[in-house]
């Protein structure tokens, strides 16, 4: 009689998953851009702000061509996890000035968390090496002043914007190799 009928398709193909991950990343990029603009309007930035605890930018656009799927997803997930921790820290310790960025900062945190889970699922479906999603990390020290919190917010949103921009390009390029 032949084999029994197989199960219906229950979940998206990894390539479709990559498509929806790109859409989610683009949407998060737009949110970050908007929130960074909102922050600049309320608290104009005096030059570039850096935060030593933030990850360095993963890759220049020109070097994207040499990337391999496991490396991109692993690095992207590690960097986004760091930004998620920083956003959580900002909401908790950023001070009253940054309360004006709510509920947008909360929405950003939720979407960042969703993107991280999407990346983890994608790596699982592809059976790529999976470093721990929640590695232990040293606690971040609270900002020294209200202005310190605002400077940190500029640095976090600016760095996240660049990382997400890199992520969209990288994920689109990887889709062609899957």
């Amino acid at each position: 009689p032949g084999p029994p009928p197989g199960p219906p398709r229950v979940s998206p193909d990894p390539r479709a998953e990559l498509d929806s991950t790109v859409l989610l990343t683009r949407s998060l990029l737009a949110d970050t851009r908007q929130l960074a603009a909102q922050l600049r309007d309320k608290f104009p930035a005096d030059g570039d702000h850096n935060l030593d605890s933030l990850p360095t930018l993963a890759m220049s656009a020109g070097a994207l061509g040499a990337l391999q799927l496991p490396g991109v997803l692993t690095r992207l997930r590690a960097d986004l996890l760091s930004y998620l921790r920083h956003v959580q820290w900002l909401r908790r310790a950023g001070g009253s000035s940054l309360k004006t960025l709510e509920p947008e900062l909360g929405t950003l945190q939720a979407r960042l968390d969703r993107l991280l889970r999407r990346l983890q699922l994608l790596m699982s479906r592809l059976a790529l090496p999976q470093p721990p999603p929640d590695p232990p990390a040293p606690p971040l020290a609270p900002p020294s002043s209200a202005w310190g919190g605002i400077r940190a917010a500029h640095a976090i949103l600016g760095g996240l914007h660049l990382t997400l921009d890199w992520a969209v390009r990288g994920l689109l390029l990887l889709k062609t190799r899957l």
């Epitope: 398709r9 390539r15 790529l128 721990p132």
Partner: antibody, heavy 114, light 111 residues
Framework: EVQLLESGGGLVQPGGSLRLSCAAS????????MHWVRQAPGKGLEWVSV????????YYADSVKGRFTISRDNSKNTLYLQMNSLRAEDTAVYYC???????WGQGTLVTVSS | QSVLTQPPSASGTPGQRVTISCTGS?????????VHWYQQLPGTAPKLLIY???ERPSGVPDRFSGSKSGTSASLAISGLRSEDEADYYC???????????FGGGTKLTVL
């Protein structure tokens, strides 16, 4: 409709070898990591091995390391498990599974006995 | 000895709500890896029931739900039906093994 069809199981003596195959259809085989999972009679599920979508990463359970080899041929939409130095405790239904695993075959029975 | 710990059995009457627990360690569930749940009806292959802690594949009724906290996870089945009688397994990736690990399975009986 997703289909995973295992074959190659049977009765083999301790120390012998078998090669299991899993023919996939109804989905983009080359985009999925593939697993072998086994279930001894009346027991629970035990993961055996996994191979990444492109075959570049392979991992094994400690209980089969050095004896079993997983491989795939994306041009044929087929997954393989080469089993050597078989032991009585390898007796089980062997399932091939795709993704998380999201999809499972119906399994093939491997019996190791003298 | 399974890496993830589940109760060997659970039971309930039709219409009731039952939960099945799954406890792991710092190398799997506690490390942040997602938990997936499978249903295995007698004499059949396992079927994905819940993935990524609480996501339902298409075709799975919303009576089934999952949650995760710390090093453990749970599967809840509400409005229990006779066709839910099956073995239920949890699974999660394990960073030290570089592969998924399964719970020992829970046999659910509908009284």
């Amino acid at each position: 409709e997703v289909q995973l069809l295992e074959s190659g199981g049977g009765l083999v003596q301790p120390g012998g070898s078998l090669r299991l195959s899993c023919a996939a259809s109804g989905f983009t085989f080359s985009s999925y990591g593939m697993h072998w999972v086994r279930q001894a009679p009346g027991k629970g599920l035990e993961w055996v091995s996994v191979i990444s979508y492109d075959g570049s990463y392979k991992y094994y359970a400690d209980s089969v390391k050095g004896r079993f080899t997983i491989s795939r041929d994306n041009s044929k939409n087929t997954l393989y498990l080469q089993m050597n130095s078989l032991r009585a405790e390898d007796t089980a239904v062997y399932y091939c599974a795709a993704g998380v695993p999201d999809y499972w075959g119906q399994g093939t029975l491997v019996t190791v006995s003298s | 000895q399974s890496v993830l710990t589940q109760p060997p059995s659970a039971s309930g009457t039709p219409g009731q709500r039952v939960t099945i627990s799954c406890t792991g360690s710092s190398s799997n569930i506690g490390a942040g890896y997602d938990v997936h749940w499978y249903q295995q009806l007698p004499g059949t292959a396992p079927k994905l029931l819940i993935y990524s802690n609480n996501e339902r594949p298409s075709g799975v009724p919303d009576r089934f739900s999952g949650s995760k906290s710390g090093t453990s996870a749970s599967l809840a089945i509400s409005g229990l039906r006779s066709e839910d009688e099956a073995d239920y397994y949890c699974a999660a990736w394990d960073g030290s093994l570089n592969g998924p690990v399964f719970g020992g399975g829970t046999k659910l009986t509908v009284l």
